[in-house]
Interface confidence: medium
């Protein structure tokens, strides 16, 4: 004598006021869990959205964004326009990164170049709108005898002074 409504399987809903207790979800609707009182309307991937996975009686449709756009939010709830590398999206559209900033992706904002001197390093490769700077060794690292690439001096025996 189970509560049958609570045991209607996924893909059905409890339609207790008709001849059946559990009825299949109507077209373009789904129930992903058992015991549902109603089926949910399938998501429609329209406009800037395109269908990645069709809706079934037990699972919602999944959307992607059309070419030139990328997903934002949980389950691709929004599509945002792509920009080129070296740009960021503003309210007025895609704008080049200001000097001293870069963006190496088609989405997101321009970020400041790394400040190599904060780590005591020098700039090995200059930054661009599309790429961050590449930091090189610090000036101290480049002085003679300081490089880790220099082989170590041979070990001296105790009591011997250098010549």
């Amino acid at each position: 004598l189970q509560d049958l409504c609570s045991n209607c399987p996924a893909g059905t809903f409890c339609d207790n006021n008709r001849s059946q207790i559990c009825s299949p979800c109507p077209p373009n609707s789904f129930s992903s869990a058992g015991g549902q009182r109603t089926c949910d309307i399938c998501r429609q991937c329209k406009g800037v959205f395109k269908t990645r996975k069709e809706c079934s009686s037990t699972s919602n449709a999944e959307c992607d964004c059309i070419s030139g756009y990328h997903c934002l939010g949980a389950e691709c709830s929004m599509c945002e326009q792509d920009c080129k590398q070296g740009q960021e999206l503003t309210k007025k559209g895609c704008k080049d990164c200001c000097f001293g900033t870069f963006n190496d992706q088609k989405r997101g904002i321009c970020r400041p170049w790394t400040n190599c001197s904060l780590d005591g390093k020098s700039v090995l490769v200059n930054g661009t709108k599309e790429r961050d700077v590449v930091c090189g060794p610090s000036p101290a690292d480049l002085s003679p005898g300081a490089s880790s690439a220099t082989p170590p001096a041979p070990a001296r025996e105790p009591g011997h002074s250098p010549q």
């Epitope: 189970q2 509560d3 049958l4 059946q20 207790i21």
Partner: antibody, heavy 113, light 111 residues
């Protein structure tokens, strides 16, 4: 939580009778699946009807019981079974149950002239 | 209406042994809406198994339900004297009328 049936009696054929299932520690204004089952002396279990409390959902009936037996919620602690046109074949112990996992001790209905 | 046919009574068993009770439904049970009950004289039924194979709360794991569709089985292993009772199967069907049906019952007795 417990259930107790009442209203069982010795009645004549053709009579009507209402059985009451009273709950302790259960609030029928919430959604519960409540059923009535009967057992003739020395015989097996026979399902009569079930309903959702706290809801307007259609009750479920055995085809033999439909029209002659009516299950309903009468308060936040009681569910009833109204029986009409009783015959000797309706002589049985009547149980109420919540979703099959909680049963009352039963009440005896005897139909005899 | 749906008919559930159980193993004929009585079934004789020995303490410590195993007993199997079968139940066949005239129609396919919907979505494993299937239960087993134990009843002792003068007492209401007690739920043992629901959803064909799920053990009800407080029921020892010696009781095992299996099957699907129209064929179901209750197996009781390591039998104890306290298991002497009548066992009923119950099927659920996806119709507002004749939603449930009980089997005729199988009595388990000890030799």
């Amino acid at each position: 939580e417990s259930l107790e049936e009442s209203g069982g009696d010795l009645v004549k054929p053709g009579a009507s009778l209402t059985l009451t299932c009273t709950a302790s520690g259960i609030d029928f204004s919430r959604r519960y699946y409540m059923c009535w089952v009967r057992q003739a002396p020395g015989k097996g279990l026979e399902w009569i009807a079930c309903m959702y409390t706290g809801s307007r959902d259609t009750p479920h009936y055995a085809s033999w019981a439909k029209g002659r037996f009516t299950i309903s919620q009468t308060s936040s602690t009681t569910v009833t079974l109204q029986m009409t046109s009783l015959t000797a074949a309706d002589t049985a112990t009547y149980f109420c149950a919540r979703e099959g996992n909680l049963w009352g001790p039963g009440t005896l209905v005897t139909v005899s002239s | 209406a749906q008919v559930l046919t159980q193993t004929a009574s009585p079934v004789s068993a020995a303490v410590g042994g195993t007993v199997t009770i079968n139940c066949q439904s005239s129609q396919s049970v919907y979505s494993n809406w299937f239960s087993w009950y134990q009843q002792k004289p003068g007492q209401p039924p007690k739920l043992l198994i629901y959803s064909a194979s799920t053990l009800a709360s407080g029921v020892p794991s010696r009781f095992k339900g299996s099957g699907s569709g129209t064929q179901f089985t209750l197996t009781i292993s390591d039998l104890e004297c306290d298991d002497a009772a009548t066992y009923y199967c119950a099927g659920g069907y996806n119709t507002v009328t004749d939603t449930f049906a009980f089997g005729g019952g199988t009595e388990v007795e000890f030799k």
